[in-house]
């Protein structure tokens, strides 16, 4: 029951996390910037991975997509790639985990197969979460370092003059959504991996138990019967179970002093 709950909770947490990663990737507020000393009206600039927007105090908003793929900074491309990889891995992980859920019966799928699928999806969720956290962190680092400010403050451009205005870009809501979502996906993945351990058949559960009828090599000992064919070895000195039942591991390979009367 605990295993099912852990697996189910892991699935739900990962689902929320991946939804958050998708939301963060699509959001425009990755970086935000306020202009306080505006000559006209309060203008609020914000950017996402795909487009840049400006919103005025009047409510007017205008967004434009980034004009070129080749002209974009390598860091931005890397962040896009990390987020997309995170989404793809997470989506595949969700698909796999649906079939792996203990509460869902699909044909005659064995627990061992479900355990493997649960582990696979768990690893995918962990990697997905790490990709999202890495992507958001790289972007945050870009903002902190203000890498574009290395340009000259004023210079003459084609057809006139250009001046770089000193401005600070701050963390947008998407960064926090991304961090939380990545963390949730990571936690969900860990939970799936933990659930996998519970789903995986324990070694002892599947050890064949051999019961042998009393034969020529049966010896009576106080505390119970020990059935043996006289072959195999009990090198592990394991307890001989009352009632004459023991596992394949405990089959003796050499006759012991008790085997012959």
């Amino acid at each position: 029951m605990a295993v099912t709950a852990c697996q189910g909770l892991g699935f739900v947490v990962s689902l929320i996390g991946i939804a958050g990663i998708i939301a963060a990737t699509c959001m425009d507020q990755w970086s935000t910037q306020d202009l306080y000393n505006n000559p006209v009206t309060a203008v609020f600039n914000y950017q996402g991975l795909w487009r840049s927007c400006v919103r005025e105090s009047s409510g007017f908003t205008e967004c434009r997509g980034y004009f070129t793929l080749l002209g974009l900074p390598a860091m931005l491309q890397a962040v896009r790639a990390l987020m997309i990889v995170g989404i793809v891995l997470g989506a595949i992980g969700l698909l796999v985990s649906i079939f792996a859920l203990k509460c869902i019966r699909i044909g005659s799928m064995e627990d061992s197969a479900k355990a493997n699928m649960t582990l696979t999806s768990g690893i995918m969720f962990i990697v997905s979460g790490l990709c999202a956290i890495a992507g958001v962190s790289v972007f945050a680092n870009m903002l902190v370092t203000n890498f574009w400010m290395s340009t000259a403050n004023m210079y003459t451009g084609m057809g006139g003059m250009v001046q770089t205005v000193q401005t600070r870009y701050t963390f947008g809501a998407a960064l926090f959504v991304g961090w939380v979502a990545g963390g949730l996906t990571l936690i969900g993945g860990v939970m799936m991996c933990i659930a996998c351990r519970g789903l995986a058949p324990e070694e002892t559960n599947y050890k064949a138990v051999s019961y042998h009828a009393s034969g020529h090599s049966v010896a009576y000992k106080p505390g119970g019967f020990k059935a043996s064919t006289g072959f195999g070895s009990n090198t592990k000195n394991k307890k001989i179970y009352d009632g004459g039942a023991r596992t394949e591991d405990e089959v003796q390979s050499y006759p012991s002093k008790h085997d012959y009367v």
């Epitope: 990755w30 970086s31 910037q33 202009l35 505006n38 000559p39 006209v40 009206t41 203008v43 600039n45 914000y46 950017q47 840049s52 927007c53 400006v54 005025e56 009047s58 409510g59 007017f60 205008e62 967004c63 434009r64 980034y66 004009f67 070129t68 002209g71 974009l72 900074p73 931005l76 972007f139 870009m142 903002l143 203000n146 574009w148 400010m149 340009t151 451009g157 006139g160 003059m161 250009v162 001046q163 770089t164 205005v165 401005t167 870009y169």
Partner: nanobody
Amino acid sequence: QVQLVESGGGLVQPGGSLRLSCAASGNILSINYMGWYRQAPGKERELVALITRGGTTNYAESLKGRFTISGDNAKDTVYLQMNSLQPEDTAVYYCYFRINFGILGGLRDYWGQGTQVTVSS
């Protein structure tokens, strides 16, 4: 790279009108402001008028009522309609754009090369 192309300047008689236009082209992202500055001989460059994409305007106090700024967001073009021109309006008029490139290059102010407006009889 952003280019600003101004047009409409010239010689006009006092009391006359002129319409300046400035078109921005190139890799333009978020335009915060479009507008006009002017610089008369031997004087500092001064603000004439600014307009936001949403249509909010700001004029130099001395020019209110005579000058009208407008913009065409689809064409990234700003216009300045100048009426009742006086000799003191003689100056080089510079087109101005403040463009936000965000993470791609910060906030930048662009000025055109300027167009000469001469008011004389």
